[in-house]
């Protein structure tokens, strides 16, 4: 008896974080023996959608022409082969931005920081929210969460960073969200450019320069609890 069918791979193009009204394509890649692909959405009747495979049968396309709140959520896909259904894929979290008005992002005491010192990025929303997110452009894991302390809804969240080093330099944005749906985010804040100047440091060239320039907990002041596969959405809760 053969073992269970390998799980398919699920991903979204152009990405898993989509602005309201934009199109997104969800891809499910299985094996050449696949006869049918099924996409399930958490808390929706299953299957959410079914598709025949595209030649050479190892993947299927699920199209969302215009992103709305209804499409935001957690997805898994399966494929059917002559011997039955596969294991589920790792989850894909499809996030919609533009659900709420944009917050304001600022740096305290200043966006110009000396290496070896500290900075606190402050994300402020007009209406009270319970989750705030900080992203850094071109980061390996672009989204990071900070839940307001004490579980209460608040107008702001602080993202402390220390010690600041050259990897912290770059463009940041923040989002706000309500706890009842982490898949619905505000419009992004205006960008904040963090400039790291001068240094007390001993710079040393390295062939193993980290690729996760803003992904790691050293570079983002958040408590890591793991990452969500294939979504680029990494959850960090306080």
């Amino acid at each position: 008896q053969a073992g269970p069918l390998p799980k398919p791979t699920l991903w979204a193009e152009p990405g898993s974080v989509i602005s309201w009204g934009n199109s997104v394509t969800i891809w499910c890649q299985g094996t050449l023996e696949a006869r049918e692909y099924r996409l399930d959405k958490e808390e929706s009747p299953a299957p959410w959608d079914r598709q025949n495979p595209l030649e050479p049968k190892n993947k299927a396309r699920f199209s969302i022409p215009s992103m709305t709140e209804d499409y935001a959520g957690r997805y898994r896909c399966y494929y059917r082969s002559p011997v039955g259904w596969s294991q589920p894929s790792d989850p894909l979290e499809l996030v919609m931005t533009g659900a709420y008005s944009k917050p304001t992002l600022s740096a305290l005491p200043s966006p110009l920081v000396t290496s070896g010192k500290s900075v606190t990025l402050l994300c402020q929303s007009r209406s009270p929210m319970d989750t705030f997110l900080l992203i850094k452009e071109r980061a390996a894991h672009p989204l990071l969460h900070l839940r307001s302390e004490h579980g209460a809804q608040q107008h702001q969240a602080e993202f402390p960073m220390s010690p600041v080093t050259s990897v912290h330099g770059g463009t940041y944005r923040c989002f706000s969200s309500h706890g009842f749906s982490h898949y619905l985010l505000s419009h992004p804040s205006d960008p904040l450019e963090l400039i790291v100047s001068g240094s007390l440091e001993d710079p040393r060239p390295s062939p193993t320069r980290s690729v996760s320039t803003a992904a790691g907990p050293e570079d983002q002041p958040l408590m890591p609890t793991g990452s969500v596969p294939h979504s680029g959405l990494r959850r960090h809760w306080e």
């Epitope: 500290s118 010690p163 990897v167 390295s206 790691g216 050293e218 002041p221």
Partner: antibody
Framework: EVQVVESGGGLVKPGGSLKLSCAAS????????MHWVRQAPEKGLEWVAY????????YYADTVKGRFTMSRDNAKNTLFLQMTSLRSEDTAIYYC???????????WGQGTSVIVSS | DIQMTQTTSSLSASLGDRVTISCRAS??????LNWYQQKPDGTVTLLIY???RLHSGVPSRFSGSGSGTDYSLTISNLEQEDFATYFC?????????FGGGTKLEIK
Amino acid sequence: EVQVVESGGGLVKPGGSLKLSCAASGFTFSDYGMHWVRQAPEKGLEWVAYISTGIITVYYADTVKGRFTMSRDNAKNTLFLQMTSLRSEDTAIYYCARADGRGAMDYWGQGTSVIVSS
Amino acid sequence: DIQMTQTTSSLSASLGDRVTISCRASQDISNFLNWYQQKPDGTVTLLIYYTSRLHSGVPSRFSGSGSGTDYSLTISNLEQEDFATYFCQQGNTLPWTFGGGTKLEIK
């Protein structure tokens, strides 16, 4: 479970050298900056050195600058502290600690003892 | 360098008491103030980071407050395991510096 375990301490003569190691487990080592902190007998804690994630940046306390070299091997999840020109005032328990990115050290090892004496 | 001062080097208290340990920085450290507990066997544990945020797994009887240069750690309803030495540390500017420590002893 996050763990950091120091090793390599011992008795060394003034002017001598010693290399401390710190083995990390339970987290993605390459994602975190790391520190060395020491504590002399009956004294408080003293920060010694810090290395950033990508080995791009290293900082040292003035008391050890030019004598100690901090490095890391992300492939082996290991942190090092090469200590040279050791002095009696370097006698201490040396702790390896993980940086939390917010100015704190969130997990510490049990420490390794370094004694500099003739 | 930023100097950190814990004026009380030792403190006696009884089980169930509420105690406050103070720490002063020589300049504004913008809330980048952390508290550690060191047990007699040398084990060091982070309790509070960024002035008031409780590190994971730390009991809620520990709390922190302060701003600018003055900070404090409060332990309410003291338990036997809380008798230890407490250090503050500034993480605002390298070199990071620690207070001299406050030893909490049983009365």
